[in-house]
């Protein structure tokens, strides 16, 4: 912490500008008014302050707002956001999507930090649910965001928000998460026709039950092996050889390469050898 010293004559900052770049830490502490800093936070981002100087500016804001910063200041934190701790952020009440976007922009290109995770958590809790605009924003910055949520947290996602989800956003989701998301996706896309529906639902199928897979097998969807391998084992096991053949279409030949891997391995063991032989792939049950 910077020692408290009087501001030298002529060095009191009338505004936040580039003349402060070469101030020493103690001079920033003594000569920059915290209230002025709060009203001109938007300028800080354009000035090449060192991380040491940013520490001093943060300290001034902390003293001015011990209960947490107002959103008018938070929105313009810029690089100073990187100095915040999760404890600092827990004091905030962030309600504007624009504020969220501004802070995520600062962290762009980096992995999700504890600060960002706390910020998102505060924001979503404040909104009560993960609406489409929020999800759009979060997945744009962090494609893996959705899969970082617990099944309980995912349950607050309204079906309408599912339209914002891209296939890559689900890459790291586990079956428990897809179990929650799939019914929402099914509801969201229910009014689409067969082929369009399959394109949209495909990424969510890791949460689909047997009856839905059976229904899909009647629609000539030609599911690729990558999607098939992500299906729930318990949902695949009851499928007949004929149903799997219809589900995969021309991709059925890929079963041979995957015969030692779940769910294909377990499914093969459940089938009669005569039925498997009809595929002509040499699969051994």
């Amino acid at each position: 912490e910077v020692e408290k010293t009087a501001c030298p004559s002529g060095k009191k900052a009338p505004e936040i500008d580039e003349s402060l770049i070469f101030y020493k830490k103690w001079e920033l502490e003594a000569c920059v008014d915290a209230a002025l800093l709060a009203t001109q936070m938007d300028r800080v981002n354009a000035i090449p302050f060192t991380y040491e100087q940013l520490d001093v500016l943060k300290h001034k804001l902390d003293e001015l707002y011990p209960q947490g910063y107002p959103e008018s200041v938070i929105q313009h934190l810029g690089y100073l956001f990187l100095k915040m701790s999760p404890e600092d952020i827990r004091k905030w009440n962030v309600t504007s999507l624009e504020t969220l976007k501004a802070l995520l922009e600062v962290n762009k290109g980096h992995e999700m930090s504890p600060q960002v995770a706390t910020l998102i958590d505060r924001f979503v809790k404040g909104r009560g649910q993960l609406d489409k605009d929020t999800l759009d924003t979060l997945t744009a910055f962090y494609p893996g965001y959705l899969c970082s949520l617990s099944p309980e947290e995912l349950s607050s996602v309204p079906p309408s928000s599912i339209w914002a989800v891209r296939p890559q956003d689900l890459d790291t989701c586990d079956p428990r998460q897809l179990d929650v998301l799939y019914p929402k996706a099914r509801l969201a896309f229910q009014n689409m026709n067969g082929s369009e529906y399959f394109v949209k639902i495909q990424s969510f199928l890791g949460g689909a039950p047997t009856e839905d897979l059976k229904a899909l097998s009647q629609q000539n969807v030609s599911m690729d092996l990558a999607t098939f391998m992500k299906l729930r084992t318990d949902a695949v096991l009851p499928l007949t050889v004929a149903e799997v053949q219809k589900l995969l279409g021309p991709h059925v030949e890929g079963l041979k390469a995957e015969e030692r891997h779940r769910p294909v391995r377990d499914w093969i063991l459940r089938q009669r050898q005569d039925d498997l032989d009809t595929l002509g792939l040499g699969l051994q049950g």
């Epitope: 003349s19 070469f22 020493k24 090449p48 991380y51 690089y79």
Partner: antibody, heavy 119, light 106 residues
Framework: EFQLQQSGPELVKPGASVKISCKAS????????MNWVKQTNGKSLEWIGI????????SYNQKFKGKATLTVDQSSSTAYMQLNSLTSEDSAVYYC????????????WGQGTTLTVSS | QIVLTQSPAIMSASPGEKVTMTCSAS?????MYWYQQKPGSSPRLLIY???NLASGVPVRFSGSGSGTSYSLTISRMEAEDAATYYC?????????FGSGTELEIK
Amino acid sequence: EFQLQQSGPELVKPGASVKISCKASGYSFTDYNMNWVKQTNGKSLEWIGIINPNYGTSSYNQKFKGKATLTVDQSSSTAYMQLNSLTSEDSAVYYCARVGRDNSGFDYWGQGTTLTVSS
Amino acid sequence: QIVLTQSPAIMSASPGEKVTMTCSASSSVSYMYWYQQKPGSSPRLLIYDTSNLASGVPVRFSGSGSGTSYSLTISRMEAEDAATYYCQQWSSYPPTFGSGTELEIK
């Protein structure tokens, strides 16, 4: 050991542009601001501007606004200065210089890049 | 911007002699910085924050002053001290340098 290695001498025609590099080694590049300084005829030194390698934010001496553009490449720990619309007035030695902790002077300097603008 | 005037412009000293050069600022500054430059070389930081010796600088160098008047002193001149010395301020934006004092060996 700390080192700022600048690119070699440049001979360019009036009206052209040039980009001078300054590669930092031996310290954490993003922890210290980088300055650029002009020296004409081995005499006076003029401060051109400063850049924060961590955030890419910069500030310029009014005299060099529009003439110089400062950038950094964090991946190679290199600072750059581009000078455009060159005239004979721009012929000089240009230095990059690191600012020490808590603004304690330009503690490390590059070896200088000689720019000659001539037709 | 603040103008720094160095005097004398040129001076010479014998080995072992005490040398003092001054730097006068057109307005008050908080700190002064001093650099040494030898022909064909980059400037080298000697003194920071008015009176602190930079790393590796011999203790025969010292700096002092306040307000608008600052000085650099070499307690005992040595041949290797022959160089041009520049003062610099950044209390007021933009940073500025003095025009230099050229120190020769007698």
